[in-house]
């Protein structure tokens, strides 16, 4: 017995061929032996059968002797043993109708599952191997989980059903939804303008939906909420902002953030949260702000950082065009007694620069000029 | 430690007034929006007035629009509420809450003062 | 205003039960949505905001779901200190709004 493989709401085409190339009395019947449809001379007939308004077949290749029977928008019930009966023969085909869908969404957030479901007729027993867009395989019977979606899952997923040693392939497309950076850090000098931006790794027609942004400042002991809005169709709007600082909000997505100006009060990590309509949980994405300030006190040239940098990033006095006087891996560094000339304070990683500010040390007589 | 300690409750007769306030510590209470909810005896919340930081922001429910007055002085950390042309429904425990927390929850209350209105 | 209808008004259960109590807003309101416990003689306090994040030191067992109008808090195991009045909160338009509460007792 031939067996074949479809596909949930796909057509199948199954075959049955007589020996003469001519068009001769055929029909095709389901294991309960309900006619499902046949010929009467050159017009097709139908039986009683459930499938009646799904099942066709070809006249165009009857001449050749080709009887196929045609079934539209596969259901797994369709799953059956046909027979064709022509010139007292019969060819019996069993079909096996399969289907694979995403637990109840293909657009989800970042962390949570994906679980993918088989709907097989009763009696098989299939095997399932599905290969994520980044090349990671799973397998399984009925169900398949994932557990965890990072990003890089985004894409089309591709399931290979296997029953008597046929297969039968499903493409689904997941679309996580998330921040193109989990994580992000600005560095700026003190005073000047700070650009927060949060652009997302997804693209929907229709983004509706709200967030907020919260702030822990180094200096403070305890975090709050920098800014909240709303997302209605990709346009922004401010629902309440902070008096300190006074943040500004672009209209439109990427979501952006300005901060007038870089304060050491202001250093610190913020997470900015967003809510989607109809979906349950948010996405995340961390910002961290470190804030350089250069000062000349009397005889002592201080350079400071504020906010999260990493214990390996070295901070460095050094005259221009000449050796680092002082470098340590602090978040402060000084030189008593500055020569005159333009100093250089300098964050670095590995050599790096990341973060640099210019005083100008006047000769002892005169104040320092900040440029 | 956040708190808030409200005072100024008492027995009113209908149509009289009274200046409830509220004692803000533990916490930089010019940075904060505050608000005032009640609750009559036996009954739900209800979400009474809020003001943004500086007092240059404030917003009502229908029921107190022009008899009730929020407003705060951060340099005392007090959070107030004038009541004026008080009626029976105003009877209730008011209190003093700050909105603190995350997607504008009300992280801290206080523990209440009680306001009855009856002759 | 936006209207919160919570249902239902109160509900009797035995330690170890499962609790869902639900709110609908007369529109919607984002996420913009908070769930508040509160004891006799007590002050309400804050246990999820944001439809489904958790305040700090609030149990595992609670959590909330929803988005735009309808909204659920689930305790998954009832505990004995679990039994007040719970209050659900919109935050998206003034005036503010709270359902009317939902009492749950001891069965």
């Known amino acids: 017995k031939k067996v074949v493989l479809g596909k949930k709401g796909d057509t199948v085409e199954l075959t049955c061929t007589a020996s003469q190339k001519k068009s001769i009395q055929f029909h095709w019947k389901n294991s309960n032996q309900i006619k499902i449809l046949g010929n009467q001379g050159s017009f097709l007939t139908k039986g009683p059968s459930k499938l009646n308004d799904r099942a066709d077949s070809r006249r165009s290749l009857w001449d050749q002797g080709n009887f196929p029977l045609i079934i539209k928008n596969l259901k797994i019930e369709d799953s059956d043993t046909y027979i064709c009966e022509v010139e007292d023969q019969k060819e019996e085909v069993q079909l096996l109708v399969f289907g694979l869908t995403a637990n109840s969404d293909t657009h989800l957030l970042q962390g949570q599952s994906l679980t993918l479901t088989l709907e097989s007729p009763p009696g098989s027993s299939p095997s399932v191997q599905c290969r994520s867009p980044r090349g990671k395989n799973i397998q399984g019977g009925k169900t398949l989980s994932v557990s965890q979606l990072e990003l890089q899952d985004s894409g089309t997923w591709t399931c290979t059903v296997l029953q008597n040693q046929k297969k039968v392939e499903f493409k689904i497309d997941i679309v996580v939804l998330a921040f193109q950076k989990a994580s992000s850090i600005v560095y700026k000098k003190e005073g000047e303008q700070v650009e927060f931006s949060f652009p997302l790794a997804f693209t929907v027609e229709k983004l509706t939906g709200s967030g907020e942004l919260w702030w822990q400042a180094e200096r403070a002991s305890s975090s709050k909420s920098w800014i909240t809005f709303d997302l209605k169709n990709k346009e922004v709007s401010v629902k309440r902002v902070t008096q300190d600082p006074k943040l500004q909000m672009g209209k439109k997505l990427p979501l952006h953030l300005t901060l007038p100006q870089a304060l050491p009060q202001y250093a610190g990590s913020g997470n900015l949260t967003l809510a989607l309509e109809a979906k349950t949980g948010k996405l995340h994405q961390e910002v961290n702000l470190v804030v350089m300030r250069a000062t000349q006190l009397q005889k002592n040239l201080t350079c400071e950082v504020w906010g999260p940098t990493s214990p390996k990033l070295m901070l460095s006095l050094k005259l221009e065009n000449k050796e680092a006087k002082v470098s340590k891996r602090e978040k402060a560094v000084w030189v008593l007694n500055p020569e005159a000339g333009m100093w250089q304070c300098l964050l670095s990683d590995s050599g790096q620069v990341l973060l640099e500010s210019n005083i100008k040390v006047l000769p002892t007589w005169s104040t320092p000029v900040q440029p | 430690e956040v708190q808030l300690v409200e005072s100024g409750g008492g027995l009113v007769q209908p149509g009289g007034s009274l200046r409830l306030s509220c004692a803000a510590s533990?916490?930089?209470?010019?940075?904060?929006?505050m608000s005032w909810v009640r609750q009559a005896p036996g009954k739900g919340l209800e979400w009474v007035a809020n003001?943004?930081?500086?007092?240059?922001?404030?917003y009502y429910v229908d029921s107190v629009k022009g008899r009730f007055t929020i407003s705060r002085d951060n340099a005392k950390n007090s959070l107030y509420l004038q009541l004026n042309s008080l009626r029976a429904e105003d009877t209730a425990m008011y209190y003093c809450?700050?909105?603190?927390?995350?997607?504008?929850?009300?992280?801290?209350w206080g523990q209440g003062t009680l306001v009855t209105v009856s002759s | 205003d936006i209207q919160m209808t919570q249902s239902p008004s109160s509900v009797s259960a035995s330690v170890g039960d499962r609790v869902t109590i639900t709110c609908r807003a007369s529109?919607?309101?984002?996420?913009?949505l908070a769930w508040y416990q509160q004891k006799p003689g007590k002050a309400p306090k804050v246990l999820i905001y944001?439809?489904?994040s958790f305040q700090s030191g609030v149990p595992s067992r609670f959590s909330g779901s929803g988005s735009g109008t309808d909204f659920i808090l689930t305790i998954s195991s009832l505990q004995p200190e679990d039994f007040a009045t719970y209050y659900c909160?919109?935050?998206?338009?003034?005036?503010?709004?709270f359902g009317q509460g939902t009492k749950v007792e001891i069965k």
């Open positions: 533990g916490f930089t209470f010019s940075s904060y929006w």
């Open positions: 003001i943004n930081q500086d007092g240059s922001e404030k």
């Open positions: 809450a700050r909105e603190g927390g995350q997607w504008l929850s009300l992280d801290y």
């Open positions: 944001g439809v489904s």
């Open positions: 909160q919109q935050a998206n338009s003034f005036p503010w709004t």
């Open positions: 529109q919607g309101i984002s996420s913009w």
